[in-house]
């Protein structure tokens, strides 16, 4: 009776009980990852004069205590709000740069325009990026060997939810001209099922936001197509006009041109076409 | 839709010499052009392009030897320094995009002879 | 530089015959399919045979075919007509908005 009302709190059925050692079809937990976060978290707090308030062994725990012991399909946003709290957090107004399958260069966008900010630019984004992690019901181990796939296993694991956890918030809190960063290289230059389609467009603000720019950047090939009248582009412009913010739309031909001019607005080459 | 050539002649070695593409039935703010020459007897050799963003391209070879600007109808090719080996017929093409990537509407060509 | 390399100067084949052109590229073309072929008969300007590796341009008898993916490429002409005989380039697009041409291939019809 008391092992059911552990089951029956946890939602899990008896068919999903774990074995002694779950194996899922995602790669482990990222090796050294309490470690990992914790040197992340001073990093980041030392570097960051309005985060030096904050105890990074209180983070760590809050980060632990959000999947240790629990089943890792059976993970709720609600099992991060301890963690969030304490990442608290504001960007400026104008400054959000949100990304879609492009990550790499809105990094290298943020690294030459300081003042503006990705989520991974944000305490709790740059604690996670790039890592893997779970734990195992009624243990208090991490996961090394595997974890579960998005696809393949479960939505609702630690990785995914943590990501449309502070996903959400972070669109939630941005004001003014929100900006996004699309890779115009893909099928869908806006899909629906990114985190960015799924999770921060319903959660902007229209009461804060003005409005959406998005770039859409053109792969290693610049051709001449005005990729902002692009099928799918032209759904996230009814997606957000429909939440009463304003959308507006660029082209961004040469990706390396456009960060060397973010670099150099003086130089001559950038009057000219980006 | 169509592209023509024009503005070739002959010349002599070093004086500079602009070729124009004239366009219709389309708009050069959302097309590329190509400039592509075919020396006597040879085959085709791809010079440069212009985008509609006014992004240019060049081949390695060509760089410094040729210029390639647009106005709203047309797209110019200057030869900055010709020599006898840029004796050549100069065709212009549009460039396709995407999933449609080729060459799909030339010019019949304009001959430019370089000769002392 | 990025190379497109027609290993054959000419071919020929009779009447209601099939020919093949290959062109092979020293890297790949941007997105494995930036790849198109023309054909190039004296005194007519140049005409856009294949676009995309495979996409037949509108226009063009499906006699003319379009094959290959990333570096290795293939234009086949089957029954061929006296109307064929040409010269046959494959022009290549590469990452970086560079392009290239192959050195052409004539076509001979017996």
């Known amino acids: 009776s008391g092992l059911n009302d552990i089951f029956e709190a946890q939602k899990i059925e008896w068919h999903e009980l774990p074995r002694w050692r779950q194996q899922w079809s995602g790669s482990g937990t990222t090796s050294r990852f309490p470690e990992t976060v914790l040197a992340r978290c001073v990093k980041y707090t030392e570097v960051h004069p309005e985060m030096r308030h904050v105890d990074c062994q209180s983070v760590w725990d809050a980060f632990k205590g959000a999947f240790i012991s629990k089943y890792p399909c059976n993970i709720t946003e609600e099992d991060y709000q301890p963690l969030v709290k304490l990442g608290t957090q504001t960007v400026p107004c104008n400054k959000t740069l949100l990304w879609s399958r492009i990550k790499d260069l809105a990094h290298q966008f943020t690294q030459v325009q300081r003042d503006m900010f990705t989520l991974e630019d944000m305490l709790l984004g740059y604690l996670a990026d790039d890592l893997t992690w779970c734990g195992e019901f009624n243990t208090f181990e991490i996961n090394y060997q595997s974890c579960p796939d998005w696809r393949k296993d479960c939505s609702n694991n630690p990785v995914s939810v943590f990501w449309k956890t502070v996903s959400r918030r972070f669109a939630e809190t941005a004001c003014g001209v929100v900006h996004v960063m699309l890779n115009g290289s893909r099928s869908k230059i806006f899909d629906k099922n990114s985190t960015f389609g799924s999770v921060e467009v319903h959660n902007l603000q229209p009461e804060k936001v003005q409005a959406l720019e998005a770039w859409v950047i053109h792969g290693g090939r610049e051709d001449s197509r005005d990729l902002c009248q692009d099928p799918t582009i032209k759904e996230l412009e009814s997606i957000i006009s429909k939440r009463n913010i304003r959308f507006f739309c660029k082209n961004i031909y040469r990706p390396d041109k456009f960060l060397q001019c973010v670099k150099n607005p003086e130089d001559s080459s950038c009057l000219s076409g980006i | 839709q169509s592209v023509e050539e024009s503005g070739g002649r002959l010349v002599t070695p070093g004086t500079p010499l602009t070729l124009t593409c004239t366009v219709s039935g389309f708009s050069l703010s959302n097309n590329a052009i190509s400039w592509v020459r075919q020396a006597p007897g040879k085959g085709l050799q791809w010079i440069g392009s212009?985008?509609?963003?006014?992004n240019t391209y060049y081949a390695t070879w060509a760089k410094g030897r040729f210029t390639v600007s647009k106005t709203s109808t047309t797209v110019d090719l200057k030869i900055n320094s010709p020599t006898t080996e840029d004796t050549a017929t100069y065709f212009c093409?549009?460039?396709?995009?995407?999933?449609?990537?080729?060459?799909?509407?030339w010019g019949p060509g304009t001959l430019v002879t370089v000769s002392s | 530089a990025q190379v497109l390399t027609q290993t054959a100067s000419s071919v020929s084949a009779a009447v209601g015959g099939t020919v093949t052109i290959s062109c092979q590229s020293s890297e790949s073309v941007y997105k494995n399919n930036y790849l198109s072929w023309y054909q190039q008969k004296p005194g007519q300007p140049l005409k856009c045979l294949i676009y995309s590796a495979s996409t037949l341009a509108s226009g063009v008898p499906s006699r003319f075919k379009g094959s290959g993916s990333g570096t290795q490429f293939t234009l086949t002409i089957s029954d061929l007509e006296s109307d064929d005989a040409a010269t046959y380039y494959c022009?290549?697009?590469?990452?970086?908005?560079?392009?290239?041409f192959g050195g052409g291939t004539e076509v001979v019809v017996k």
């Open positions: 093409a549009r460039e396709g995009a995407g999933s449609s990537w080729g060459f799909n509407l």
């Open positions: 212009i985008y509609g963003s006014g």
């Open positions: 022009a290549g697009g590469y990452s970086g908005n560079i392009n290239g």
